[in-house]
């Protein structure tokens, strides 16, 4: 048995007569033989679930669900209740109604076995019938909504009449009907005004019924019509077996460059017309098991269950359903030497499904793990300016397909043939497994005999120690020009274009900082700033070279404080800034301020 609503509302007035009927509560059956029996909780509750008093005023007819006043609620009784309401004005009280034989403790009131009945209290006597508006004669202030379980026997779930009105204003005629389309499973009995289902409902056909209740009031010669929504929600049960959309039960996958733990290798989708079990229970009740195969496969793969609610069209309306994605995921990083082909089977079980048929599916994954060989081009040719500053990025080296790699740890090293001309360094970028070449020793760069630099690039897979090699030829171009006096270590210090471009700074490939002119659109990613190279800084990402020294690109790498209009980067730097952003790396501070148009002369004059 279950209640068709979780809450009911009615009005209570001072000195309302004992015997006044208040409202009906309704229970629906889960099985045809069930007979409802209602009982009231012992206590009345007030604001914030405060237990006010034992309920001495309201009774229920156990078989019909009719609540009525057992004795009049007078002023003194109401005062007594109000005193216990933690100092709040007592505007509403509620009772708990339980369905026997459900033996719920009084403290808990959860649908489906318990409903709350709220009474709005009016510190006056019942108003004169002639003063009541049609809306007050027809419907409670709070609009009801109903919940009906699918596949359950039909039954009565609502009674339209406002019983106190009918009891105290017998001369006012009130008639009700339901506006509904053809063939809907609801009926309003003209005599009893009870609303019932005609047949068992199927949620997978229709989940929500937005009906309209029409009330016609006849008082003497006048007739008025009031209409309110009458929504019914159909509650789901696990009556649909899982299926494969379009019959696809097999997925094939190749594991090659993406070999990182947690990589999704393949996905198979399962459709279930149900939305139960609910999300909290779903993973426990909707199980997936990777069937035992060889030990290697069991250690290498796991299956992840990703359920998602979707909506499907049924009979012209949309109903919710569930799609379950089963992802075959790498459980560990795979060595580049690994080379296998296998078939994996996954058993999916909708354990709540009662039939007919089975709630079990078998998913198949065909997986090929291919080995990866390391290749570098035979030769790299690059040029570098003699004016380049330390940490200037001058190029990249990358084993074949390195951009596509994940879970493959390749380290790059440079071996110099000229001992005194070891100018460059290389660091491996975790993002794309490439090696970033940068200037490491500017003194060597300036030596006349270091006009051509010869290196061997060696790429090594850390797990297998497999290697690839290439020649690197670097031409040193231009002549060295000493820096202006007073130039900062970091390009980011400069706040104006003029002072930016006349200086170099750490990370500058040309020996000169570059000014990036922003778009001036409020707090923007494209803020004005001075950079060693606008190709790499700022780009919203503190790369592996920039991490070597905070002076290279504090705009991307600073962990300190940013003053002024900005949006902080994740996890560091400036994601967006207002106007011009300049930084003092040694002080771990950046400032984003409106564009500074003043003439440099003003500084000294106005100081």
């Amino acid at each position: 048995l279950y209640f068709s609503r979780d809450a009911y509302w009615e009005k209570l007035y001072v000195d309302q007569a004992a015997g006044t009927p208040l409202l009906y509560v309704h229970a629906l059956r889960d099985a045809p033989e069930e007979v409802p029996s209602f009982r009231l909780g012992q206590h009345l509750y007030g604001t914030y679930r405060t237990r006010l008093h034992e309920n001495n005023w309201i009774c229920i007819q156990e078989d019909t669900g009719l609540l009525y006043l057992n004795r009049s609620l007078d002023h003194s009784s109401w005062e007594k209740l109000s005193v216990r309401n933690r100092g709040f004005p007592l505007l509403t009280v509620y009772l708990k109604v339980f369905l026997s034989p459900t033996s719920l403790r009084e403290g808990e009131c959860q649908w489906p076995g318990c409903a709350r009945v709220y009474f709005s209290f009016f510190n006056t006597s019942f108003p004169a019938c002639s003063s009541l508006k049609p809306r007050e004669l027809c419907f409670p202030e709070t609009r009801p909504s109903f919940r009906i379980r699918e596949n359950r026997p039909p039954g009565t779930f609502h009674q339209f009449r406002l019983l106190p009105v009918q009891f105290l204003c017998p001369n006012i005629s009130v008639a009700y009907r339901l506006l509904e389309g053809e063939g809907l499973p609801f009926r309003c009995a003209p005599d009893s005004l009870e609303v019932s289902t005609r047949w068992a409902l199927d949620r997978e056909q229709r989940e929500k019924y937005e009906l309209v209740a029409v009330c016609t009031v006849h008082a003497g010669a006048r007739e008025e019509v009031v209409m309110v929504p009458f929504p019914v929600t159909v509650y789901d049960e696990d009556d649909s077996a899982p299926t494969f959309p379009a019959g696809v039960d097999t997925a094939s996958a190749v594991v090659e460059f993406k070999r990182k733990e947690d990589t999704v290798v393949a996905t198979l989708r399962v459709f279930d017309a149900d939305v139960v079990p609910a999300s909290g229970e779903l993973v426990r009740r909707y199980t997936s098991t990777l069937l035992p195969g060889d030990t290697w496969a069991q250690q290498t793969f796991r299956v992840e269950h990703w359920p998602n609610e979707t909506s499907v069209q049924a009979n012209g309306s949309f109903v919710r359903a569930t799609v379950h994605d089963y992802r075959l995921v790498l459980n560990r990083n795979l060595s580049i030497s690994e080379n296998r082909t296998m078939q994996l089977a996954v058993l999916v079980n909708d354990s709540d499904f009662q039939g007919p048929g089975a709630g079990v599916l078998l998913l198949h994954f065909n997986v090929s793990v291919l080995p990866v060989s390391l290749h570098l081009p035979s030769t790299y040719s690059l040029s570098v300016s003699r004016r380049a500053r330390r940490f200037a990025q001058i190029g990249k080296v990358c084993v074949e397909n390195c951009q596509a790699f994940s879970g493959i740890n390749v380290q790059y090293k440079l071996h110099s043939s000229g001992a005194n001309c070891s100018t460059l360094g290389v660091v491996t970028s975790a993002e794309d497994t490439s090696g970033i070449l940068f200037v490491n020793d500017t003194k060597a760069l300036r030596r006349p005999k270091c006009a051509e630099l010869h290196y061997m690039v060696v790429a090594t897979d850390q797990q297998t120690s497999r290697q690839a090699q290439a020649q690197l030829l670097v031409t040193v171009e231009g002549s060295y020009v000493a820096e202006e006096a007073g130039c900062p270590l970091s390009c980011a210090v400069s706040k104006r274009r003029l002072e930016c471009e006349e200086c170099g700074g750490l990370g500058s490939p040309t020996g000169r900082c570059e000014w990036r002119q922003g778009d001036g659109k409020g707090i923007t990613r494209n803020f004005s700033t001075c950079s060693p190279s606008t190709k790499t800084c700022p780009d919203g990402h503190c790369d592996v070279v920039e991490t070597q020294d905070i002076n290279i690109c504090p705009q991307d790498c600073l962990r300190g404080s940013i003053v002024g209009g900005h949006e902080p980067g994740e996890p560091r730097g400036i994601k967006a800034g207002y106007g011009t952003c300049n930084c003092f790396p040694e002080e771990e501070k950046c400032f984003c301020e409106p564009e500074d148009i003043q003439d440099p002369l003003c500084d000294e004059l106005c100081r």
């Epitope: 270590l489 905070i550 100081r607």
Partner: antibody
Framework: QVQLQQSGPGLVKPSQTLSLTCAIS??????????WNWIRQSPSRGLEWLGR?????????TYAVSVKSRITIDPDTSKNQFSLQLNSVTPEDTALYYC?????????????WGQGTLVTVSS | DIQMTQSPSSLSASVGDRVTITCRAS??????FNWYQQKPGKAPKLLIY???SLQSGVPSRFSGGGSGTDFTLTISSLQPEDFATYYC?????????FGQGTKVEIK
């Protein structure tokens, strides 16, 4: 040849203000490429950098957190000097105080120092 | 703040000895690192800046090495005027901090 000449009282009462001046010759307090620093030395704390002032389009000051709420370093372009003010002193501030020139942009090394002023905080 | 730890805190050596003093930073400071010499009653004097660059006028027997967190000052052949206290300093982030000093005494 750059020279830094310090001046100021050697005795200050607790809760009063310590004031020292550093006069520069052979360089300019407004020079773009350097910063002008105050450093102190005591047996308990060793060498402790206090703060600096420097000019680059605008004047900037940077102070050590340990004294930030009490310290002011001011340049005086007309006299080509800079000063230190340390408010609300306690006996803990007793030390040998130095001014020094810092090369702002090559990693801030201190290549010229004043002769030092021993300041005692005592009533 | 970045802590600078010097070792040893003092050492005894003879004229002509090769002496090495080490300094460790509590975090990576690249080469933003200097060495100073201080004699009693005098201000500190810059010896080495940027970890390994010799300040002009400083004898070539002084040399600096290291990068990151570990640094050394080496005096290849100790002279009588080298008996003094030596301080290391980081200038990577403010506040600039110094080591506690290493006193080089005559054996």
């Amino acid at each position: 040849q750059v020279q830094l000449q310090q001046s100021g009282p050697g005795l200050v009462k607790p809760s009063q203000t310590l004031s020292l001046t550093c006069a520069i010759s052979g360089d300019s307090v407004s020079s773009n490429s350097v910063a002008w620093n105050w450093i102190r030395q005591s047996p308990s704390r060793g060498l402790e950098w206090l703060g600096r002032t420097y000019y680059r389009s605008n004047w900037y000051n940077t102070y050590a957190v340990s004294v930030k709420s009490r310290i002011t370093i001011d340049p005086d372009t007309s006299k080509n000097q800079f000063s230190l003010q340390l408010n609300s002193v306690t006996p803990e501030d007793t030390a040998l105080y130095y001014c020094a020139r810092g090369h702002r942009y090559s990693g801030s090394y201190f290549d010229y120092w004043g002769q030092g002023t021993l300041v005692t905080v005592s009533s | 703040d970045i802590q600078m730890t010097q070792s040893p805190s003092s050492l005894s050596a003879s004229v002509g000895d090769r002496v090495t003093i080490t300094c460790r930073a509590s975090q990576n400071i690249n080469s933003y690192f200097n060495w100073y010499q201080q004699k009693p009653g005098k201000a500190p004097k810059l010896l080495i800046y940027a970890a390994s660059s010799l300040q002009s006028g400083v004898p070539s027997r002084f040399s600096g090495g290291g990068s990151g967190t570990d640094f050394t000052l080496t005096i290849s052949s100790l002279q009588p005027e080298d008996f003094a206290t030596y301080y290391c300093q980081q200038t990577y982030t403010i506040p600039w901090t110094f080591g506690q000093g290493t006193k080089v005494e005559i054996k």
